[in-house]
């Protein structure tokens, strides 16, 4: 089942090797499973992580650094993202989305 | 320069509790995930942990899962390994590490390392 | 979990010697693979990182090669100070896994 989230579409432009936060706002009530996506120009988005609610943990996909993905909840109606170190390949459109099951 | 010391380490018995800390300086803390890596003695390295620069996220080896507890104190500059039900397998020297910020990851320099034995 | 195999286990080699030590790992890693020096008594240091960028201050001698499931690391003109234990790792997918060490002794 697929979930709404209450996004609000920024732009932000950071400088190279500096770091970057995006909210993603959680509607209320969503549990399961939230995942955060790259969709860059030409290419499928790729999924870069997911954070399971019910373990309070988050898995990383294949080739993803901690050191460069920064998951954290700052309250329970938002999940946030820090990119790191940033780099030129770094720019994208990042989304986050969810489902129960 | 990036410098990081462990402390902590010692015997304990069997089922016993043991907290390492690994006082960081030289870089700034909260921008970098760290992590643990221990060694048995005369064998390999086997990473243990790794939690995130904002202390939000954390990973285990599953030998540790649900024994060990990662955990930071960004204005102390201060990383921790809680270690609890420990067992004759856990003995070893435990290193911190500074990770990368890259999009693949390693570890940067490492401390020195402290002895951790789980004897009776 | 990602196996790393490291092959020889240990070495025996005389200065100014070419040595090599492979690392193998049980998928694709792509480039996602670290080398570290380890000497007796001492903590690991990185030497390589994502397969082919040597760590700063880490000599020209040292020289890797690979991608995917195969690499290796080539050591010319062995220095007295390259004595030590050498470790691959995959940064791939955690677990992160490291080779069981390849051990380079003097002859």
């Known amino acids: 089942k697929s979930s709404n989230l209450e996004g609000r579409t920024k732009s932000v432009i950071r400088q190279t090797g500096s770091s970057a936060e995006i909210t993603c706002d959680l509607a209320e009530g969503s549990t399961g499973y939230i995942h955060w996506y790259l969709h860059q120009e030409g290419k499928a988005p790729q999924r870069l992580l997911y954070y399971d609610s019910y373990t309070s943990s988050v898995v990383l996909e294949s080739g993803i650094s901690p050191g460069k993905y920064d998951t954290y909840g700052s309250t329970r109606k938002n999940l946030r993202m820090i990119l790191r170190n940033l780099i030129e390949n770094d720019s994208g459109v990042y989304y986050c989305a969810t489902w129960d099951g | 320069q990036v410098q990081l010391v462990e402390s902590g380490g010692g015997l304990v018995q069997p089922g016993g509790s043991l907290r390492l800390s690994c006082a960081a300086s030289?870089?700034?803390?909260?921008?970098?995930?760290m992590s643990w890596v221990r060694q048995a003695p005369g064998k390999g390295l086997e990473w243990v942990s790794t939690?995130?620069?904002?202390?939000?996220?954390?990973y285990y080896a599953d030998s540790v899962k649900g024994r060990f507890t990662i955990s930071r104190d960004n204005s102390k500059n201060t990383l921790y390994l809680q270690m609890n039900s420990l067992r004759a397998e856990d003995t070893a020297v435990y290193y911190c590490?500074?990770?990368?910020?890259?999009?693949?990851?390693?570890?940067?320099?490492w401390g020195r390392g402290t002895l951790v034995t789980v004897s009776s | 979990d990602i196996q790393m195999t490291q092959s020889p286990s240990s070495l025996s080699a005389s200065v100014g010697d070419r040595v090599t030590i492979t690392c193998q790992a049980s998928?694709?890693?792509?480039?996602?693979l670290n080398w570290y020096q380890q000497k007796p008594g001492k903590a690991p240091k990185l030497l390589i990182y994502?397969?082919?960028s040597l760590q700063s201050g880490v000599p020209s001698r040292f020289s890797v090669s690979g991608s995917g499931t195969d690499f290796t690391l080539t050591i010319s003109n062995l220095q007295p100070e390259d004595f030590a234990t050498y470790y691959c790792?995959?940064?791939?997918?955690?677990?992160?896994?490291f080779g069981q060490g390849t051990k380079v002794e003097i002859k």
């Open positions: 939690v995130s620069g904002s202390g939000g996220t954390t």
């Open positions: 998928q694709d890693i792509s480039n996602y």
């Open positions: 790792q995959q940064s791939y997918s955690i677990p992160w896994t």
């Open positions: 994502a397969a082919s």
């Open positions: 590490a500074k990770d990368s910020t890259a999009v693949t990851d390693w570890f940067d320099p």
């Open positions: 030289g870089f700034t803390f909260s921008t970098y995930a």
